[in-house]
Amino acid sequence: SEVEYRAEVGQNAYLPCFYTPAAPGNLVPVCWGKGACPVFECGNVVLRTDERDVNYWTSRYWLNGDFRKGDVSLTIENVTLADSGIYCCRIQIPGIMNDEKFNLKLVIKPAKVTPAPTRQRDFTAAFPRMLTTRGHGPAETQTLGSLPDINLTQISTLANELRDSRLANDLRDSGATIRIG
């Protein structure tokens, strides 16, 4: 059965997924999809990497960890109730039927009536789309229009706080980390 993760409307959701590359930078393609993992690939792909970098993405979905070290955990920005459901993290190991598949259940709760402001929410309101420890380049007009030139490395501490949350430990403790090579 799926491991369950929770987030509130308006917050960022974190869905952990890890693997151990055979060698540093020797990446395995990964896809994230909405819906349970099918036999092949990912259904309703929201993000994909190849052997080098992120090559397919949709707005609000990010890899905030160091994916070159195997942290392919997904962050979904500013979630709504519609983001609830099963997500598939698929580690696409070469060879027939070698893929590792993880189904993660995301439960979105309505926001509290009078939510106390948090650093995280204040940050994402000011700079939606830029919450990442990795440079993902310029803002896209589809999501933001224009955005001041922000140095993404200045905000890595906050992303680290997200990544080091209890949810990350939950998955690590459950043994859903794979080693390749």
Epitope: G25, R48, R52, D53, V54, N55, Y56, W57, T58, S59, R68, T133, R134, G135, H136, G137, P138, E140, T141, Q142, T143, D149, I150, N151, L152, T153, Q154, S156
Partner: antibody, heavy 118, light 106 residues
Framework: QVQLQESGPGLVKPSQTLSLTCTVS?????????WNWIRQPPGKGLEWMGY???????SYNPSLKSRITISVDTSKNQFSLKLSSVTAADTAVYYC???????????WGQGTTVTVSS | DIQMTQSPSSLSASVGDRVTITCKAS??????VAWYQQKPGKAPKSLIY???YRYSGVPSRFSGSGSGTDFTLTISSLQPEDFATYYC????????FGGGTKVEIK
């Protein structure tokens, strides 16, 4: 094997609009990646102009934002650059290139020279 | 915008030499730096991405290092086909390139 090929007029008059097209073969533009325009004035360095992503979202160099438009024609697997109100300073070799979400560039076209002159 | 200052702007070297090119960012760009090689009349070719990862097909004599603001491209043993101009590029915010380093035959 992915290939990119720029095309368009080699001579544009000042104040007019420069229009270039990049034809992509070996990969569908809508399948992924960011599709970029980069230019290089004669004897000078490289300048990133902007991109259109696989989903159609765009991002532009702030220094060009008021003059630049990048669009895509998925039926022809092409993306295009329009740069308005050109001056002699826009004379350059124009390259199209395929980039990642973090925009670094693995595949480049061979480049096309555009001269702005009356 | 983020300026990338490359040095030297040109250098003369012999086949077999070890060549080092540096690039300094005007602010912290993490490891979000790429290096390209360009020969006259040709498009640039990708050498290094994410500061230290060699692009596929790039010979092992090319290596990249650095993080934050200081980055280095090293050619461990210069070969005849390596005489070219080299550019660094940051992609921590909208992409900007260094001014280039021309590697010439001594």
């Amino acid at each position: 094997q992915v290939q990119l090929q720029e095309s368009g007029p080699g001579l544009v008059k000042p104040s007019q609009t420069l229009s270039l097209t990049c034809t992509v073969s070996g990969y569908s533009i809508t399948s992924g990646f960011a599709w970029n325009w980069i230019r290089q004035p004669p004897g000078k360095g490289l300048e990133w102009m902007g991109y259109i992503s696989h989903s159609g979202s765009t991002s532009y160099n702030p220094s060009l934002k008021s003059r630049i438009t990048i669009s895509v024609d998925t039926s022809k697997n092409q993306f295009s650059l329009k740069l308005s109100s050109v001056t002699a300073a826009d004379t350059a070799v124009y390259y199209c290139a395929r980039g990642y979400r973090s925009p670094w560039f693995a595949y480049w076209g061979q480049g096309t020279t555009v001269t702005v002159s009356s | 915008d983020i300026q990338m200052t490359q040095s030297p702007s040109s250098l003369s070297a012999s086949v077999g030499d070890r060549v080092t090119i540096t690039c300094k960012a005007s602010q912290n760009v993490g490891a979000n730096v790429a290096w390209y090689q360009q020969k006259p009349g040709k498009a640039p070719k990708s050498l290094i991405y994410s500061a230290s990862y060699r692009y596929s097909g790039v010979p092992s004599r090319f290596s990249g290092s650095g993080s934050g603001t200081d980055f280095t491209l090293t050619i461990s043993s210069l070969q005849p086909e390596d005489f070219a101009t080299y550019y660094c590029q940051q992609y921590n915010s909208y992409p900007t390139f260094g001014g280039g380093t021309k590697v010439e035959i001594k």
